[in-house]
């Protein structure tokens, strides 16, 4: 499955929108920094077959989409930017879903990366728990925004590696 060129452009647009969403000075939020334990090893792309990598990417985008689709998120961010960001993520999900169906049919590895998907889900559970503990404060959302920018960058790099493999 070849991800369309528009997919990588969508990635870049999503990161730009996320960068624009910042509302308060990052400097005032240093004390709220937190180790979410991003599962970096799931995004290095070396041990994966393509089908596995695509389904991990899908889970990452799906969880990001879910996180920014909550009522608390709507209250935290400027609405038009949030809507554009969600639209970009939704388009990426559609691209990846088409690929997941195609690749799983080719490689027949539907259960091989359950652990990887679980690692991504647990990562987002830690993010949600942090937001809850911090009562969805503006600084907590800034820390999470920075974290998601970092994790989306890892996703983008993994997609670049997948394209190079094609």
């Amino acid at each position: 499955c070849d991800l369309p060129q528009t997919h990588s452009l969508g990635n870049r647009r999503a990161l730009i929108l996320l960068a624009q969403m910042g509302r308060i000075s990052h400097f005032s939020c240093l004390k709220d920094r937190h180790d979410f334990g991003f599962p970096e090893e799931e995004f290095d792309g070396h041990q994966f077959q393509k089908a596995q990598a695509i389904s991990v990417l899908h889970e990452m985008i799906q969880q990001t989409f879910n996180l920014f689709s909550t009522e608390d998120s709507s209250a935290a961010w400027e609405q038009s930017l949030l809507e554009k960001f969600s639209t970009e993520l939704y388009q990426q999900l559609n691209d990846l879903e088409a690929c997941v169906i195609q690749e799983v049919g080719v490689e027949e590895t539907p259960l091989m990366n359950e652990d990887s998907i679980l690692a991504v889900r647990k990562y987002f559970q830690r993010i949600t728990l942090y937001l809850t503990e911090k009562k969805y404060s503006p600084c907590a959302w800034e820390v999470v925004r920075a974290e998601i920018m970092r994790s989306l960058s890892f996703s983008t790099n993994l997609q670049k590696r997948l394209r190079r493999k094609d």
């Epitope: 920094r33 920075a146 920018m149």
Partner: antibody, heavy 121, light 107 residues
């Protein structure tokens, strides 16, 4: 390979202006903040200030507020430290270093090689 | 501003010695503390971040501990290349501040 490369040593007279630079490469320049640190001859490290190159938001240590200006040009991945009127007491080694911002990652993990500024009449 | 106080300001030790440097913050900084090593004419080098996390590439003889206001850097067995000046730095709030440094010299 991540690198912060600073401009060369400067010899200036009191009252002169100066702008030194710190060019980042090998990483996404706007994903990290750039801090500046002063070290006077034979002395310890003093934190001067920091800039977020993504939006040029800047903070200074009270000791350096109004004495220096920190800026950045993200199009060329470069941060700057400048003086409008140097004093002999500005003679020091100046270092830039990158900071991961709000991300949980090592603070000030890469440093420039330092720029020696000498101010003498 | 948060004040950082290191002790001792200098110490003499031999190769193989266990060396301990302490750093005290004027208020709680949680675990937002970094340790740096600096050799003459060189830029500082990050050793430990977040009080106890060893920076990539740093030998395991270096370790950090503490939280709140009191922190420790330990070198379990001093090596010839470890003779340098060590600085702690708080990273919880701006302005970031350094300790005054501890110079580790050869006995």
């Amino acid at each position: 390979e991540v690198q912060l490369v600073q401009s060369g040593a400067e010899v200036k007279k009191p009252g002169e202006s100066l702008k030194i630079s710190c060019k980042g490469s090998g990483y996404s320049f706007t994903s990290y903040w750039i801090g500046w640190v002063r070290q006077m001859p034979g002395k310890g490290l003093e934190w001067m200030g920091i800039i977020d190159p993504s939006d040029s938001d800047t903070r200074y240590s009270p000791s350096f507020q109004g004495q220096v200006t920190i800026s950045a040009d993200k199009s060329i991945s470069t941060a700057y430290l400048q003086w409008s009127s140097l004093k002999a007491s500005d003679t020091a080694m100046y270092y830039c270093a990158r900071h991961p911002g709000l991300n949980w990652a090592p603070d000030f993990d890469y440093w420039g090689q330092g720029t020696l500024v000498t101010v003498s009449s | 501003d948060i004040q950082m106080t290191q002790s001792p300001s200098s110490l003499s030790a031999s190769v193989g010695d266990r060396v301990t440097i302490t750093c005290r913050a004027s208020q709680s900084i949680n675990r937002f503390l970094n340790w740096y090593q600096q050799k003459p004419g060189k830029a500082p080098k990050l050793l430990i971040y977040a009080a106890s996390s060893l920076q990539s590439g740093v030998p395991s003889r270096f370790s950090g501990s503490g939280s709140g206001t009191d922190f420790t850097l330990t070198i379990s067995s001093l090596q010839p290349e470890d003779f340098a000046t060590y600085y702690c730095q708080q990273a919880i709030d701006l302005p970031f501040t350094f300790g005054q440094g501890t110079k580790v010299e050869i006995k």
